[in-house]
């Protein structure tokens, strides 16, 4: 039978009822978020019942990891002071009904949060009572009754093979620590190209087949379980395993790898182009001129020589570039008369060509003295 | 507010049955622990029978195999079936319920409950 509630005393909190006042309680989602619209209404109550009410004292959640120990947790900062509150257990309709105290408590900021119960001490196929109790307050109790079985969570399948069974077809292999026949399971598989996992039940066998499998795709591979249906009807999952992975390691990159690259790589060519027509201007700024042959004859004529005029050299530069050698100039015509132009023979400068252009003038050294 | 508003009691012979509705308006029940207690004349309030809204439930001792909770979230509704009736079922049942974070929730404690009926007579006679 059930057991009876720890004893009462008559401390009570806030006369709210006679308000009709409701108390709003923020309580913790199972995904650790707050939920403030679950309002704690403070209504109507049995003719005999409270006049007054007492703060609703937080939820027990137990999990059974393994069935190797069980955690019952509970959201300690709810309380509206820090409250070393007690938990007390037994099973309903059993040799186990005997109420037990607590032995291994959890702690949140040395506040009790949790109590952890081993495995000697965990029955599964009997509704389990779980009574959270404010040790200053007695009255403030609460009492859950749990099926155990429904709240297994197994540790993550370990040990992943592959096997290739044919030129095409590859087999998955795991294993679970001692649940095996227990368990239901869940396998993902992706490639590098794929943008999301594909995903298959599994049922207690732990082996999966892929018929068909693409010799130039690197496959990835992993598996969680959970306790269902054949022992238990279990919602949660383990966690995942340890991923493996089969296939080609030259295949090519995922795409957002590839598009990342292209992205990179022409980025890289823009910046490698502006900053060579940076160069490019600068040098056009602070280096002369430098004409082609082709309009050497037209700067020549309209600048009448004056070399400084049109290079872009400034004066003194110019002036300061002044040879201290005596010049010999060269003269050049476009065909040579027969019998020789002026200059050749033994004495003829070296500079003397048969060109149909200008050319600079030519320079013969002279020794300083 | 949360009004509950049980339904179905009456008089009923031994070993007969009574099927014992709980219509809730003002909030949904589809994410509350919902829970069914009675109480004799001259004796404290028990419980009876509980829910999670996981959809785990439980039964005191004395009404296990003859008692069946059930819930219709579509018409926000929980519903006792009381089967093999006995002369000591007599008594008036209530119905309450509280908003529960977890699926697993499931309260046999009275004042763990945030809103309640004001109950129907139900009467066994031998």
């Known amino acids: 039978m059930l057991k009876p509630s720890l004893p009462f005393t008559s401390l009570l909190f806030l006369q709210l009822p006679l308000l009709g006042v409701g108390l709003n309680t923020t309580i913790l989602t199972p995904n650790g978020n707050e939920d403030t619209t679950a309002d704690f209404f403070l209504t109507t109550m049995p003719t005999d019942s409270l006049s007054v009410s007492t703060l609703p004292l937080p939820e027990v959640q137990c999990f059974v990891f393994n069935v190797e120990y069980m955690n019952c947790t509970w959201n300690s900062s709810s309380e509206p002071q820090p409250t070393n509150l007690t938990l007390h257990y037994w099973y309903k309709n059993s040799d186990n009904d005997k109420v037990q105290k607590c032995s291994h408590y959890l702690f949140s900021e040395e506040i009790t949060s949790g109590c952890q119960l081993q495995k000697k001490e965990i029955h599964l196929y009997q509704t389990f009572v779980v009574q959270l109790q404010d040790p200053r307050e007695p009255r403030r109790q609460a009492t859950q009754m749990l099926k155990l079985q429904n709240l297994v969570i197994p540790w993550a399948p370990e040990n992943l093979t592959l096997h290739k069974l044919s030129e095409s077809q590859l087999e998955l292999n795991w294993n679970n620590r001692f649940l095996n026949h227990c368990l239901e399971h869940l396998v993902q598989y992706r490639t590098d190209w794929d943008h999301s996992w594909t995903e298959q039940s599994v049922d207690y066998r732990h082996k999966f087949s892929l018929p068909s499998v693409d010799g130039q795709k690197r496959y990835t591979f992993r598996v969680r379980s959970r306790f269902n249906p054949l022992c238990g009807s279990a919602q949660h999952w383990s966690e995942w395993s340890h991923p493996i992975h089969w296939g080609s390691n030259t295949s090519k990159e995922n795409p957002f790898l590839f598009a990342l690259e292209a992205v990179v790589i022409s980025v890289g060519s823009m910046g490698l182009i502006i900053s060579l027509l940076c160069v490019y201007f600068w040098l056009e700024r602070t280096m002369p001129r430098i004409p082609t042959l082709k309009n050497l004859e037209d700067l020549v004529t309209e600048y009448h020589g004056n070399f400084s005029a049109w290079s872009g050299v400034s004066k003194g530069l110019a002036e300061s570039l002044q040879p201290d050698y005596s010049e010999r100039l060269c003269l050049v015509s476009e065909i040579p008369p027969k019998g020789g132009a002026l200059g050749e023979g033994p004495g003829a400068s070296p500079c003397n060509q048969h060109s149909p252009y200008w050319a600079p003038p030519c320079y013969t050294l002279k020794p300083e003295t | 507010q949360v009004q509950l508003v049980e339904s179905g009691g009456g008089l009923v012979q031994a070993g007969g049955s009574l099927r014992l509705s709980c219509a809730a308006s003002g909030r949904t029940l589809s994410r509350d622990a919902m829970g069914w207690f009675r109480q004799a004349p001259g004796k404290e309030r028990e419980f009876v029978a509980a829910?999670?809204?996981?959809?785990?439930?439980f039964y005191a001792d004395s009404v296990e195999g003859r008692f069946t909770f059930s819930r219709d979230n579509a018409k926000n509704a929980v519903y006792l079936q009381m089967n093999s009736l006995q002369p000591e079922d007599t008594a008036v049942y209530y119905c309450?319920?509280?908003?529960?974070?977890?699926?697993?929730?499931?309260?046999?404690?009275?004042?763990?409950?945030?809103?309640w009926g004001q109950g129907t007579q139900v009467t066994v006679s031998s």
């Open positions: 829910d999670s809204w996981g959809g785990d439930t």
């Open positions: 309450a319920g509280a908003p529960t974070s977890f699926a697993t929730t499931a309260y046999s404690s009275s004042n763990s409950y945030r809103y």
